[in-house]
Each structure stands twice: as C-alpha cells, then as structure tokens.
C-alpha cells in the first residue's frame, strides 16, 4: 500500500512570495496513483484544491483563484508538489496531500 | 500617519452607477487585505466586499453580488468599488477598512484602520 | 449566513461603571471574534480580536472573553470617551457579518 509524507511540517514565506510544498509518495510508483492536495483553513471545512491524476492529468476546484496554484510531479524523487504563488493572508492554512491508487 | 480616504459618493438615480475609491497611505499598501463596509443612514454596519493583498481572493455579500466589483490597484496604493444597478437599499456611508496584517509569529483577522466614509444617495 | 446578536440592544450607565455586552453567534466561530467602537458620524475603531486580544493602544479597562458561539465584551470602569456604539463581528466564515450593535449611553 502507499504511504504518504510531507517532509515540512511548517513553511513560512513572505508576502507574494511563492511557496512549494512536497509530498513523498513510497510503497507504490507515484506514476500509477493519482495526488491530491486539500487546504484547511482555521474555521472552515477542508477544500479540494487540485489534483495530478497518474496520466499527468492536473484539474483544479472551481472557483479557486487561477494562477494561484501549480500542481507537479516528479518521478525521479517520487514526489508530488503543490506551488502556491503570491502568497498572501489568505492563503495560511494546513495543506494536505492524498493518495488514490489506480 | 497611517490613513484611508474615501472618495467618489454622490446622488444617483436607482439604476445608476458609482465608482468609489480610496487612497492609501502611510502603510505598504500591497501587503494588507481591504474591505468595503457600509452604513446605512441610523442602522448598524454592514460588511459589503472584501479583496486579498495580491487579488486572489474577492468575496461580496449577498447583497450585492453580482453588482457591485471590488478591485485595487497596488502601484497606486489605492483600492475601487464600483457599483452598478444602485438601489434605494444601498444608500449608506461606505468605509473602506484595512484587514489587520501578518507578521511570521501570529494572524488575525480584524479592521485595524478605517476611513472616515463617502456617502452613496440613491433616490430619483 | 452567520447571524450575530448582541444584547442588550442600549444600555444606560453612569461613569465608572461595569458595562457587560454579550454577543452571540448562530453557529461556532471558534474564537474568531472582533469587537469595535463607533462614535457618532466617526468611523469604527477596532478595540478587540481574536475574541480577546486587545488591539494596541485600547485602554486595558476593556477586556474580551468567550469562544464558540458565546462572546463578552467588557467595560471594567466606564469613562466619558466610552458612550458610544459597541459591534462585534465574526471572521470565521464569508459573509463577514456584524451584529446589530449596543449603545451605551449616559443614565
């Protein structure tokens, strides 16, 4: 079975700067699952926000600010990341990545 | 001094349009969000629109969804509402209000500053 | 919509007294919870965040409490400069919306 780690617990960036998050994909070829990123925001309930399906396949919630978010994935290191450009206020939250298997 | 100045209120007939805005100063004015609030002559506040420091993010009330457009411009330190299809309902004093800003140890969220409002009449 | 209610609607004080203003939410908004002062023909100005948290330069004698759905402001001492209208406002979910207000006025 997959498992899943985000290396950064914590990431503290300046204002409308970018920020890149990273999610480790072992026990399973990041090729053959799909990546899923969801933010928290203090208050609120847990958003979809996109998503690298195994085929590079990127789609992204409507209705979230385009541009703002950049989904990748690199084979090499197996790792799937979430780029978040312009940071802003609005943006702090807790970012969690999931795993679908094919 | 850390200032808003709110300008471009008037008389207009409902149906009409509105462009409010409201010059900035003494803060870097691209590192705050900003709000629209209005009051409505003898009643309380409302809030109307809010928009995030870099434009990501613009949310409306109900209210005047649809016809009202929040925007800023950075460069010009400078943040508009314009507001199209005026109703009798949107006679009010209209502040424009800075959001409390982000340092790397706390956020919160809360209208630190405050402009001393334009007044919109809507009336034929 | 999160609906804020503040009671009571007008209070009448004399100076140095305790005034106790109460806001409550129609949901939970964990502590997400700004209080604000307004003169007459003034803009608002921000006395409380965070539910608790004294904006900086705000006379100590006003003090925030409460989280969830159940909010206070309080007024330890109340002076002249005090007399005005007190709102609370959540910023836990869009809308932001505001309650309703309390005057505080001269007995």
């Known amino acids: 079975a997959g498992h899943l780690e985000q290396p950064q617990i914590s990431s503290t960036k300046t204002l409308s700067k970018t920020a890149r998050l990273e999610c480790v994909v072992s026990g399973i070829t990041i090729s053959a699952t799909s990546v899923y990123w969801y933010r928290e925001r203090p208050g609120e309930v847990i958003q979809f926000l996109v998503s690298i399906s195994y085929d590079g396949t990127v789609r992204k919630e409507s209705g979230i600010p385009s541009g703002k978010f950049e989904v990748d994935r690199i084979p090499e290191t197996s790792t799937s990341t979430l780029t978040i450009h312009n940071v802003e206020k609005q943006d702090i939250a807790t970012y969690y990545c999931a795993l679908w298997e094919v | 001094e850390v200032q808003l100045v709110e300008s471009g209120g008037g008389l207009v007939k409902p149906g009409g349009s509105l462009r409010l805005s409201c010059s900035a100063s003494?803060?870097?004015?691209?590192?705050?969000?900003m709000n629209w609030v209005r009051q409505a002559p003898g009643k309380g506040l409302e809030w109307v629109s809010s928009?995030?420091?870099?434009?990501?993010?613009?949310y409306y009330a109900d209210s005047v969804k649809g016809r009202f457009t929040i925007s800023r411009d950075n460069a010009k330190n400078s943040l508009y509402l314009q507001m199209n299809s005026l109703r009798a309902e949107d006679t009010a004093v209209y502040h424009c209000?800075?959001?409390?800003?982000?340092?790397?140890?706390?956020?919160?969220?809360?209208?630190?500053?405050w402009g001393q409002g334009t007044t919109v009449t809507v009336s034929s | 919509e999160i609906v804020m209610t503040q009671s009571p609607s007008s209070v009448s004080a004399s100076v140095g007294d305790r005034v106790t203003i109460t806001c409550r939410a129609s949901?939970?908004?964990?502590?997400?919870l700004a209080w604000y002062q307004q003169d007459p023909y003034k803009a608002p100005k921000l006395l409380i965040y965070?539910?608790?948290t004294l904006q900086s330069g705000v006379p100590s004698r006003f003090g925030g409490r409460g989280s969830g759905t159940e909010f206070t402001l309080t007024i330890s001492s109340l002076q002249p400069e005090d007399f005005a209208v007190y709102y609370c406002?959540?910023?836990?979910?869009?809308?932001?919306?505001f309650g309703q207000g309390t005057k505080v006025d001269i007995k």
């Open positions: 949901q939970g908004i964990n502590s997400w």
């Open positions: 003494g803060f870097t004015f691209s590192n705050y969000d």
């Open positions: 406002q959540q910023y836990n979910n869009w809308p932001r919306t």
């Open positions: 209000a800075r959001d409390v800003g982000v340092t790397t140890d706390y956020y919160y969220y809360g209208m630190d500053v």
């Open positions: 965070a539910a608790s």
């Open positions: 928009i995030s420091s870099s434009s990501s993010y613009i």
